[in-house]
Structure formats: structure tokens, C-alpha cells
Amino acid sequence: HNTTVFQGVAGQSLQVSCPYDSMKHWGRRKAWCRQLGEKGPCQRVVSTHNLWLLSFLRRWNGSTAITDDTLGGTLTITLRNLQPHDAGLYQCQSLHGSEADTLRKVLVEVLADPLDHRDAGDLWFPGESESFEDAHVEHSISRSLLEGEIPFPPTS
């Protein structure tokens, strides 16, 4: 599997999409996991609804949400309020029994918030009547890793 890079800005939301063959993965729940080291296990962060029919309902673990368009064949993961510690290698998985197929390997990169260096007077905050949901923008800049690029820093 190639690794796709998704870049997001610290403090904002990052949306990761994982396309898949909807027929091949029909009836299967999906999951988002974090790779622990280059050869380590992939630790489950969040999985889709326990009922495959209801995979369109968002399921959360902390600030990470997952939802699955099972007809269109797109798994979407939202990392809200992205933090530097969220950077790393992840996988979108399709579950069957105790097995998991990798749909996509994802490298999440967290960029510094350019607003951090501005005068606080320039910052915009949502008004009382506006919900946080309407205020935040979900960014995702993605690219594939170039051949020879390493998603983990080399260990000494």
C-alpha cells in the first residue's frame, strides 16, 4: 500500500477520506487505527457503528469521528481540534471476523497554526448563537508519499 499524506492545521479539523470498493467490502464494518512504530501493531482508535446498516451514523472516540458511506465506498475520519501529538501513521481498515484489511495507509501531518503569532485582537470567535460546528472548517491537503520517503523517523 502507498501512504497518503493528509496535512492539517493545529487547532482546526482535518478530514481524512479512504475510498474503497463498496461491493468487495459489502457488509463489513470499518475502523481507523494508529500505527505504533514501523513494524508495531495498529491500535484501534474508533470503529464504525456496530450495525453495518447504520454505518452512516458518526461514532466517536474523543475528538475523532468516523462515518462510512457504504454505497459510495468512502470512509471518512474527522480529527477535530488537531494537535501536534496527532501526527503519525494511521490505517483505514475493513473488518471481517478477527481479520482486518488495510484500505489505505495515511500519514497525518500537523502544521503550525499561523494565527498563533498574530495579535489576539485579530482572532475571530463564533458568536453566542453560532454553533462550534458551523465555525470550524475541515481541511485536508493530501498527497502520496514519494518513493523512498519514510513515514517514520529512522531509529538510532
Epitope: N50, W60, F132
Partner: antibody, heavy 120, light 111 residues
Amino acid sequence: QVQLQQSGPELVRPGVSVKISCKGSGYTFTDYAMHWVKQSHAKSLEWIGVISTYSSNTNYNQKFKGKATMTVDKSSSTAYMELARLTSEDSAIYYCARDDGHYVYAMDYWGQGTSVTVSS
Amino acid sequence: DVVLTQTPLSLPVNIGDQASISCKSTKSLLNSDGFTYLDWYLQKPGQSPQLLIYLVSNRFSGVPDRFSGSGSGTDFTLKISRVEAEDLGVYYCFQSNYLYTFGGGTKLEIK
């Protein structure tokens, strides 16, 4: 605090439609799906369906397909359910209930209910 | 469809007594993800249902520790260790492993 405020009681004629509302407050509306539940003397509690407040996708209990239509208005944090071609069988209390997709995985908060009476 | 059968239909108790309600499912509610999707709700007179217990044995926030849930597979039990006047009402079990189904309810009332 989390609140689900439902519209008031309805007294309607057979054959017409009615649309009831459920306004969520005290939480981020689009983070939680919304269920609708019917309570009648004959059948205790029956699940009607669920709607994603985020995507507006729905799933209905087979029994209520063609009878109930669920919608959401994100801008007002309100979920709606329309009941069509009403008969006396539809006389009941209808509840909206929030779906907790975080860790509880259940209907964690309920509206106060909307009474629908179908009578000529 | 999954059917949840609650017993008894009516449970007369004295304040301070222990109460036990059974809920049996026609199919196992254990999911492949390891969770068992069985909850308990209480509907007090004139009120909406309220969540008591989720995923078999977890008390929802604010629910007193006199309420406990247990069971596995198809057989589940809700116990109230010392019934108080505010506990009176109708108790429903509920499953979300095969879409959604409520039990028929058990009315807890004073003897």
C-alpha cells in the same frame, strides 16, 4: 445542560399529515444522531427510525416506511418527523431521543414527548 | 426480528425491598466487537423514558448505585438493591444489536 424540546400536542383529522419538531440545545447538535420512538397503549415503545444530524442519512423501521419521514435543519439544531395519512392507529406519544455515539451507544437523552391524537 | 421478553409484567414491592427484573432475547446480543448491546430505561409516571444502564452493566451518569445490570448472551437482569419511592415506574430493556427493539415493560409498584 442537554435538552431536547419537542413541539406541542396535536389534534388532527384522519387522512392528514402532521410534522413534529425536536430542538436540541446544550450540546453540538451535529455530533449526535436523533432517534424517534412511538409510545402507544397497545405496543409500548416502538423504534421508528434514526437520522444523522450531520449527513441527513436515515434508517427506518420497516413498519414505519411510508408513514414517517425524518428530516433535520442544522441551522436551527432541530430534527423533524412528519407522519402521513394519519389514522387512529397513529394516536400516540412520539419522542425524539439523542443517540450517543461516543461511549454510551444508547439513547442517552429524550425529549418530553409530543402527543398526537387522530380524531374526526 | 429480535423479541425481548420481560418478566414479571408487574412487580409489587415494599419500599426498601430488593427488586429484580428479567429480560430474555430471542437472539444473542453479543456483537463481534465484544460489546453486548443491551440497555435499561425507566419511565416514571408522566415522564419520558430515561437511560439507567447501558451495555448490560454500566450505570449512566447520575444513576444511583442501587441499580445494577448483569447478564450475557440472551439473558439479562436489572436489580434494585433497596427500592425507593422515586424508583416507581415502568422499566424497559432495549437492544441495539439488530436494529432496535424494546421489551414490553415491567411496572414497579407499591404493594
